[in-house]
């Protein structure tokens, strides 16, 4: 028994990390494979991580983390058995994906306006809760051409823009995700899908 | 909310013993390291001991290595911290604390105060 | 005689700035982070910085603190009266296998 693709690991920032990995072939790795994680800290100790099946060679982890900070540095065994098949470590501060956020509702009736809110997926006192920023996707179910994405670069979660600005009488969906420089973290995936039916009253022609 | 609630402290002899103890409730006890940090009267802190959050690793300050034991309970939420051939210079204010890289929430302290 | 090293004193008047240095090592703040803790007249100590720079929930922004090498330090700014206090910053420190605080800073707001 092999490891073919090493473990590469992701962090939240918050509570877990996810390490995914393959193997030389198909693997029960629930019952195959242990993945031992501990913090280079000196009042720590080594907590075991019983991994998941992710396709018939890939194996998935998600390792139990508190208050990550910056210096975290975690070592990672990956065992079978008595046998030690990759040794390694992960500092999730440099591999961070934040969470995606989520309640993302599309109030319409505020006189042709569109405010899109959503929720900050990190309690106050993580550090990520003031240095996210979102990029909102908003789509057309009839046309697949008309796709847009807002950026949203500052920290409040919520978006206004003009209802006119989308075609009148037909039905969008919208979706936020979130990232955050200081970390220079991946995008998080997508926050579920909302939908609503776009309608404003078109302005008098002026003649 | 975090709550560290320590007692225990009090008036003994030089050569004599006391057993700390700090309830914690607020968060889950069993996760998270913990220290005890005391404070002279008129003095700085000082960090005395502390512990993992399964006893799989404990440190001491080299000043009350080999009379102090810090110990946990985490069906009870609570830390312990036996002190045995106490000395005039362990007066002192006695505090835990939830540990991690950061001392993040601490009790109100207990007086202990060793004198003839 | 602390591991790491602060004045014993700071001073500055309402509406000024103020900043704490704190000197250590390459076993403690060179290679581990910095907390900065505040101490009221007669209560426990509370976590004012993490992280070197980071703030808990509820600290006021007029707090800040950086870190640079073996040495770290805190800036307040906008003093207050109700800043006046013992400033202790902290590191765990590998050598020492303990958590090591500097001597404190007591901060009068004149």
């Known amino acids: 028994m092999k490891v073919l693709q090493e473990p590469t690991c992701v962090s939240d920032y918050m509570s877990i990390s996810t390490c995914e990995w393959k193997m030389n072939g198909p693997t029960n790795c629930s019952t195959e494979l242990r993945l031992l994680y501990q913090l280079v800290f000196l009042l720590s100790e080594a907590h075991t991580c019983i991994p998941e099946n992710n396709g018939g060679a890939g194996c998935v982890c998600h390792l139990l983390m508190d208050d990550v900070v910056s210096a975290d540095n975690y070592t990672l065994d990956l065992w079978a058995g008595q046998q030690l098949l990759w040794k390694g470590s992960f500092k999730p501060s440099e591999h961070v994906k934040p969470r995606a956020p989520g309640n993302l509702t599309v109030h319409t009736n505020v006189s042709d306006t569109l405010l899109l809110t959503w929720s900050n997926p990190y309690p106050p006192d993580n550090y990520l809760y003031n240095h996210l920023t979102y990029a909102v996707n908003i789509w057309s179910e009839n046309d697949p051409a008309d796709f847009r994405i807002y950026n949203v670069t500052y920290l409040e979660p919520s978006l206004r823009i003009a209802a006119s600005t989308l075609k009148s009488g037909i039905s969008y969906r919208a979706r936020v995700r979130a990232w955050a420089q200081c970390y220079n973290t991946t995008w998080s995936e997508w926050s579920p899908s909302t939908k609503w039916h776009n309608s404003y009253r078109e302005p008098f022609e002026q003649h | 909310e975090v709550q560290l609630l320590e007692s225990g402290g009090g008036l003994v002899q030089p050569g004599g013993s006391l057993r700390l103890s700090c309830a914690a409730s607020g968060f889950t006890f069993s996760n998270y390291a913990m220290s005890w940090v005391r404070q002279a009267p008129g003095k700085g802190l000082e960090w005395v001991s502390g512990i993992s959050h399964g006893n799989g690793s404990i440190y001491y300050a080299d000043s009350v290595k080999g009379r102090f034991t810090i110990s946990r309970d985490n069906s009870k939420n609570t830390l312990y911290l036996q002190m045995n051939s106490l000395r005039a210079e362990d007066t002192a204010v006695y505090y835990c604390?939830?540990?991690?890289?950061?001392?993040?929430?601490w009790g109100q302290g207990t007086l202990v105060t060793v004198s003839s | 005689q602390s591991v790491l090293t602060q004045p014993p004193s700071a001073s500055g008047t309402p509406g000024q700035r103020v900043t704490i240095s704190c000197t250590g090592s390459s076993s403690n703040i060179g290679n581990n982070t910095v907390s900065w803790y505040q101490q009221l007249p007669g209560t426990a100590p509370k976590l004012l910085i993490y992280?070197?720079?980071h703030r808990p929930s509820g600290v006021p922004d007029r707090f800040s603190g950086s870190k640079s090498g073996t040495s770290a330090s805190l800036a307040i700014s906008g003093l207050q009266s109700e800043d006046e206090a013992d400033y202790y910053c902290g590191s765990w420190d590998y050598s020492l296998s303990a958590y090591v605080f500097g001597g404190g800073t007591k901060l009068t707001v004149l």
């Open positions: 992280d070197n720079s």
């Open positions: 604390a939830k540990t991690g890289r950061h001392f993040d929430y």
